[in-house]
Structures are given as structure tokens and as C-alpha cells.
């Protein structure tokens, strides 16, 4: 019989009260093969964190900044359960950090030396840890100790709590810094009050300060928020403007047999009968013997962390970045407006031998880092880990979902102008073999798919988002009696025809056979009745362009192309024959790395690009013999793309709607994962 | 100017073994890492293996656990020993660093 225990880590004597009582109204609402809880007390929270690392406790609820204590080795604990406030239509996981400024005051985050600060207090995570935690590289040095240097970097600040003898600065805008609300520019509220009053320069704060201290949108309408990026947004926009994304109060457990479905199974029947409103004998929610016991008062309820989510990613970069300077207090020896090798995100061996040979050519511009799947690739991106990486459309929005932006554009047309004029696209198609004649769009349930990968554009996200508009539901592996789309589950009817050996099977990277535009189509010519791929796949793997014994002696004439209309046509005929156009492939990357990544990528496409004639003497960026490794082989140049430069722009309304609609087939962990950061 | 001399080729049975290295005059080789590339009669010349300046190195995956490549910063020189020889393995065998031409190569015949 499996253990269903929850053993749960309680810090206080008042905390291990609650617990009991938890543990018994529990019993009383739960069948006995239900969940159950246990209590184990600890002096601490690092203290439990080390328990349930040592499988001595189960679960425990933390603020983030022991999120991140917990995530450390040895404890290496995940978030699987978080707090949410507010109401369960609009529930709240996460609170903004933000920097607040007076609208005409002119400068910009990166112009902070010399003005004046409010901070909610020291030591605190909105109002001290992240802001100083991102500007800490920026402080004088010795940047030990940390009050100091911060007191030298501003001209002067009020941070409540801080010792006003050893740093009278800190205390020149509060006299006496004192820790409570005494100090009328204490807390959230006193922060935002140091701004208004002109005292300070920037209040460094959280979202919800600037309209619980003004109701009115005309009032709120005289501040702005600084962004990471050095622009300034209007208060409303935090979204899109601040410091970090932080949790507010999580649930961790072990990331290996961290019973975290059990964990949320029996949180979940907790809240049912003891959360808001639900119960008057115990509330889940509500500490009679003290403040915030085991759960937070003020939380309205739970949500299931997804299991894609660890701690970094749950934690964001931006947060990470700041705790980590400040524990660690490691800044880089280059001078910070030269921009630091880019790590290149590669897929799989294949990919990863070109981008070693691309980094030996750069002479130290490129480093490299592996990954098995474009969705680790996008989390390494995300947290730091790795820089940038090219990709097809669909993985482009599911990396906008994720935060990251658009800053170059595959270009696959010779023109004279390349590197200025993005194109508007290339061309969706579903090939088939001349032999079958019968076959049309309107008769393709029953045969066999090939795809280039599950998410990508022409492979899956615009022939399947066709075909559930026709047929309604997600089961596209019972619509096809077999086929190949890397990616899909390695049960799935949809793997059948893969040819990976082994664990490689179906796997979405080259190690697959059948991946990609030319995997598709050799799953086409070798076994499948329809693949779906680009309109310049079936040109480039025909007519001895391909060298690969399977398609050399190929003949473009025996393929045509399906039509939405149900007529099929020469497969020179794309453009009145296509299932729709697709955004080019682009390059993507995290907001604070764009503007390095766009000039180191255009520098090293003017040494390795189309510019570059022997491709046998000469490393070339855009060739892999028709593998496509690290960029389309077709690729001409890297477009600048002007003010298209967000994934909702860069793809067009159209497009994002498509794979929207399609986004209740998704069975991308990562997608679910960032949209639960970002609904 | 840096130049690079490749030499260790010969003719080999299959299964058999071989050691070639790349030897550079001038200074400065290698700062950036040193690739062996190989070209068969009529084909395309592709990427064997690489060495990176921090030690860093990879390979081709039809010559993985069967050839190393190794380094020597003092000689100036780059190392490829290759065992367990197979005939697809025939080819004129060059060495080469960013910025600097390929040399002549040195040719690898297995014969079965």
C-alpha cells in the first residue's frame, strides 16, 4: 500500500499546534485511503528545507527568498503548490517588484548613481534585496560592506532599519531610519510616501503601493516605472516594466519523489473544506495563535505549480539574478558595456559539432550550450544558462510566452538589401506522392502523417490547427492511423513511423531521423502519405541537391502539393497552393541580452553568412548539407526587425490566434509552465 | 605569419592505427582552438574533430571513442590519434586554426 502521509514541517510551537489541528480535521473529511498529514517540527525554515531534503518531512510553505535557499544543492527542492490571493477568477501567485518615479524627472535605470532612493526597509525583498541585488555590479567598490557602498551610490536614501550611526546616508531622508510605522516613510506605503513628499528620487516598491496609495488614475497618471531595458512605462504596465516577478508563498518538495501530486491531492481537498469561507471549526487560512501559520492568512487559496517549473523558472531570472549577486557578490571583470561571449543554445550532437566549430571561428564571440529538446533550450535561455538560439515560429511563441524576444529574422530571398527587410514569410505545405492520386485534403483520416516536429509551423501548429477546426477535439493521433512527429508521446500512434533507434525515437532533434523539413520529407518518401513541411523542402532534397543515399535520385515532379480547396497542384505552384504562410524562422533571446546579440549575430554573419563563396574551405553559418543545424540552410541573412521586435508582433495577429485556438492541444510542458507565471 | 604542417598519414589496414599532427610555426596557434577537418575523393570536406583553447573538445559522431584528439601548447603542436581505422575513414586529413590557411593535408588510405 503506498504511503499517502504527507509529513508536514511546522517552525514554531503555535505552527506545530496548527498542524495537529490540520492533521485531525483532516481525518475526519478524508476517506482512509485519502491523503493524511503528519507533523514534524523544526527550530527554522532552513532547518526544515534540510529535512525534507533528507526525506525526514514532506512539504513546507516558503517566501521566495528561501525558494531559492531550498532550490540550492544539496537541497535541490522544487515548487509544486502556490499560494494564491485575490479572487479565483483573477487569482494572484505573484507579486512585481517595481522602481517608481515622478514622470518629469528624466532619467532612466541606468542613470540611478547620484539620485536619491526610498526603500520599503533593509533587507527587504521588494524594497531592498532585488532592487540592490540587480544594481549591485553597478555600486563602488568595495561593495563590502553592502550598506556602505549603497550609500555611496545614491546621494542619499531612506532605508528603514538600517544602523543610521554607521550609515547616516541610508537615514538622510527619514531621520533616525526607524523600523516601523512610526517612521512615516516605513513599509510599502512609506516608501511610496518618500517619492511623493520629494524626498526621493525612485521608491523601489511593489505593484499594488502606487494604486493602494492613489485611487485616482489622474494622480497615478504622474509616475512612471523604470524598466530593466532603460525605458520608462506608464504604472498600469508592470506587467511589461519591473525589477522582478516574485512568488509570494510557496510549497516545496523534493525534485525526486517529492510526492508532489499527493502533496497537491491532499492540499487541494484542504482547501475544499477548510479554505475562505468554507468552515468555522478549522480555517486553512487564519492563525488564532499567532500570524501567517503554516499557510499565509491573506491567501485566498492554492494552484498546482506545473511540473515543468523548477525553482529558477518559477523564481524568474530577473529575481535569481539579484538574490544571487547579493549572496554571492561575484560581478564580472569586464567593463559592462562590452558585451560577453553568447551562448548559442544547440540541439543534439549534430547541432552541437557546428556550433563548436562556430565558436573556434568566432575567435571567443560564440560559446555553446547543449540541450535535448527546443523546449530546454527556451528554459536555458530564460534562466541564463544560454543566451540565444534560432526558431521556428511556433517555438517562438511559446519563447514570448516565456519572456524572451525576437531580434533577428531568417531571410531566404537573395535581395540587395537583405539584412534591412524582413520578409514577409514562407509558404505552409502538405506534399504528397504523384502516385496517389486520390488522395486529397479532404480524405487525409486514416493515412499516415509525417510532421516536422509537434509545435513547429508548417509541420504541426498550421496543418493541425486547420484540422481541428474541422474536426473539434485534440486527437490528431486517432485522425491518422500512424505518423511521425517528433515530440508527441513515444506511445502515441504518432511516433509509429519514426526511425530513431532506441530512446532517439520520435525525440524532437536531429537525432531522430524524421525530424525537421527534410526528416518529414524523407518520412514521406520512405513511408508516410503526406508530410508537412515548407515550400522550398521538396526543390532542395530533389534533384541530386541531396547527397544522402535516400535522396539522391529523387525527382521533384513526382510530388504535388494538397490544397485547402481540395485540388492538388505542381509543387512549383506553392504560392496558389499552400496551407497558409508562416512567420520565417528567428532568432530569440532574453530582453537584457538583445542588443549584444544582435551585434555580435550581425558581425559574425558578415564573416560566416552568404557572403561567404567556398563553403569547403570556409566555415558558413547557414550550411549543414541540408540538415538545417543552428539555421535553416536556406538562410541568406539575418534581418533586422525594426519595431516588430515582440513575439505578438513578429508572428502577426493571425498567426498568434491560430496557435492560441490550437493552445487547448497543446502538450507543451513549457508553455504551460510560462503561462503559469504570466496567465 | 603562422603556417600549419600536417603529417602521420599513410596506408593502413582496417582495425588498424594511425597518429597524425599538426605542427605550427609562428606564434599564437591554436589560441582559439584547432579543428581537423577531412575530405574523401569527391565529397565534401567535413569536420572530424576539434580542440578548443580551455581543453574543450568534440567529435564527429562516425569517429567518437575511436579517435582522440590531444594538445600540446609548448610544441606548438595538435595531436589525432586515430584507432580501430575503418575505410570510410579515407581521406586527405587537414588541421586548421581561424585565420590561418589549410595546409597540404596528409592522406589516410584504409584499406579492408
Known amino acids: 500500500v503506498p504511503d499517502k502521509t504527507v509529513r508536514w514541517c511546522a517552525v514554531s510551537e503555535h505552527e506545530a499546534t496548527k498542524c495537529q489541528s490540520f492533521r485531525d480535521h483532516m481525518k475526519s473529511v478524508i476517506p482512509s485511503d485519502g491523503p493524511s498529514v503528519a507533523c514534524v517540527k523544526k527550530a527554522s525554515y532552513l532547518d526544515c528545507i534540510r529535512a525534507i531534503a533528507a526525506n525526514e518531512a514532506d512539504a513546507v510553505t516558503l517566501d521566495a527568498g528561501l525558494v531559492y535557499d531550498a532550490y540550492l544543492a544539496p537541497n535541490n527542492l522544487k515548487p509544486v503548490v502556490a499560494e494564491f490571493y485575490g479572487s479565483k477568477e483573477d487569482p494572484q501567485t505573484f507579486y512585481y517588484a517595481v522602481a517608481v518615479v515622478k514622470k518629469d524627472s528624466g532619467f532612466q535605470m541606468n542613470q540611478l548613481r547620484g539620485k536619491k532612493s526610498c526603500h520599503t526597509g533593509l533587507g527587504r525583498s521588494a524594497g531592498w534585496n532585488i532592487p540592490i541585488g540587480l544594481l549591485y555590479c553597478d555600486l563602488p567598490e568595495p561593495r563590502k560592506p553592502l550598506e556602505k557602498a549603497v550609500a555611496n551610490f545614491f546621494s542619499g536614501s531612506c532605508a528603514p532599519c538600517a544602523d543610521g550611526t554607521d550609515f547616516p546616508q541610508l537615514c538622510q531622508l527619514c531621520p533616525g531610519c526607524g523600523c516601523s510605522t512610526l517612521n512615516q516613510y516605513f513599509g510599502y506605503s512609506g516608501a511610496f510616501k518618500c517619492l511623493k513628499d520629494g524626498a526621493g528620487d525612485v521608491a523601489f516598491v511593489k505593484h499594488s503601493t502606487i494604486f493602494e496609495n492613489l485611487a485616482n488614475k489622474a494622480d497615478r497618471d504622474q509616475y512612471e516605472l523604470l524598466c530593466l531595458d532603460n525605458t520608462r512605462k506608464p504604472v498600469d504596465e508592470y506587467k511589461d516594466c519591473h525589477l522582478a516577478q516574485v512568488p509570494s508563498h510557496t510549497v516545496v518538495a523534493r525534485s525526486m519523489g517529492g510526492k508532489e501530486d499527493l502533496i497537491w491531492e491532499l492540499l487541494n481537498q484542504a482547501q475544499e473544506h477548510f479554505g475562505k469561507d468554507k468552515s468555522k471549526e478549522f480555517q486553512l487560512f487564519s492563525s488564532p495563535h499567532g500570524k501567517d501559520l503554516l499557510f499565509k492568512d491573506s491567501a485566498h487559496g492554492f494552484l498546482k505549480v506545473p511540473p515543468r517549473m523548477d525553482a529558477k523558472m518559477y523564481l524568474g531570472y530577473e529575481y535569481v539574478t539579484a538574490i544571487r549577486n547579493l549572496r554571492e557578490g561575484t560581478c564580472p571583470e569586464a567593463p559592462t558595456d562590452e558585451c560577453k561571449p553568447v551562448k548559442w543554445c544547440a540541439l543534439s550532437h549534430h547541432e552541437r559539432l557546428k556550433c563548436d566549430e562556430w565558436s573556434v571561428n568566432s575567435v571567443g564571440k560564440i560559446e555553446c550550450v547543449s540541450a535535448e529538446t527546443t523546449e530546454d533550450c527556451i528554459a536555458k535561455i530564460m534562466n541564463g544558462e544560454a543566451d540565444a538560439m534560432s526558431l521556428d515560429g511556433g517555438f517562438v511563441y511559446i519563447a514570448g510566452k516565456c519572456g524572451l524576444v525576437p531580434v533577428l529574422a531568417e531571410n531566404y530571398n537573395k535581395s540587395d538589401n537583405c539584412e534591412d527587410t524582413p520578409e514577409a514569410g514562407y509558404f505552409a505545405i502538405a506534399v504528397v506522392k504523384k502516385s496517389a492520386s486520390d488522395l486529397t485534403w479532404d480524405n487525409l483520416k486514416g493515412k499516415k502523417s509525417c510532421h516536422t516536429a509537434v509545435g513547429r509551423t508548417a509541420g504541426w501548429n498550421i496543418p493541425m490547427g486547420l484540422l481541428y477546426n474541422k474536426i473539434n477535439h485534440c486527437r490528431f493521433d486517432e485522425f491518422f492511423s500512424e505518423g511521425c512527429a517528433p515530440g508527441s508521446k513515444k506511445d502515441s500512434s504518432l511516433c509509429k513511423l519514426c526511425m530513431g533507434s532506441g530512446l532517439n525515437l520520435c525525440e524532437p532533434n536531429n537525432k531522430e531521423g524524421y525530424y525537421g523539413y527534410t526528416g518529414a520529407f524523407r518520412c514521406l518518401v520512405e513511408k508516410g502519405d503526406v508530410a508537412f513541411v515548407k515550400h522550398q523542402t521538396v526543390p532542395q532534397n530533389t534533384g541530386g541537391k541531396n547527397p544522402d543515399p535516400w535522396a539522391k535520385n529523387l525527382n521533384e515532379k513526382d510530388y504535388e502539393l494538397l490544397c485547402l480547396d481540395g485540388t492538388r497542384k505542381p509543387v512549383e505552384e506553392y504560392a496558389n497552393c499552400h496551407l497558409a504562410r508562416a512567420p520565417n524562422h528567428a532568432v530569440v533571446t532574453r530582453k537584457d541580452k538583445e542588443a549584444c546579440v544582435h551585434k555580435i549575430l550581425r558581425q559574425q554573419q558578415h564573416l560566416f553568412g552568404s557572403n561567404v563563396t567556398d563553403c569547403s574551405g570556409n566555415f558558413c553559418l547557414f550550411r549543414s548539407e541540408t540538415k538545417d543545424l543552428l539555421f535553416r540552410d536556406d538562410t541568406v541573412c539575418l534581418a533586422k526587425l525594426h519595431d516588430r521586435n515582440t513575439y505578438e508582433k513578429y508572428l502577426g495577429e493571425e498567426y498568434v490566434k491560430a496557435v492560441g485556438n490550437l493552445r487547448k492541444c497543446s502538450t507543451s510542458s513549457l508553455l504551460e509552465a510560462c503561462t503559469f507565471r504570466r496567465p | 605569419q603562422v603556417k600549419l604542417e600536417e603529417s602521420g598519414g599513410g596506408l593502413v589496414q582496417a582495425g588498424g592505427s594511425l597518429r597524425l599532427s599538426c605542427v605550427a610555426s609562428g606564434s599564437g596557434f591554436g589560441i582559439n582552438g584547432v579543428i581537423w577537418y577531412r575530405q574523401a575523393p569527391g565529397k565534401q570536406r567535413e569536420l572530424v574533430a576539434l580542440?578548443?583553447?580551455?581543453?574543450?573538445?568534440n567529435y564527429r559522431e562516425s569517429v567518437k571513442g575511436r579517435f582522440t584528439i590531444s594538445r600540446d601548447d609548448a610544441k606548438n603542436t595538435v595531436w589525432l590519434q586515430m584507432n580501430a581505422l575503418e575505410p570510410e575513414d579515407t581521406g586527405v586529413y587537414y588541421c586548421k586554426t581561424p585565420g590561418v590557411p589549410f595546409g597540404q593535408g596528409t592522406q589516410v588510405t584504409v584499406s579492408s
Open positions: 580542440i578548443k583553447s580551455d581543453g574543450y573538445t
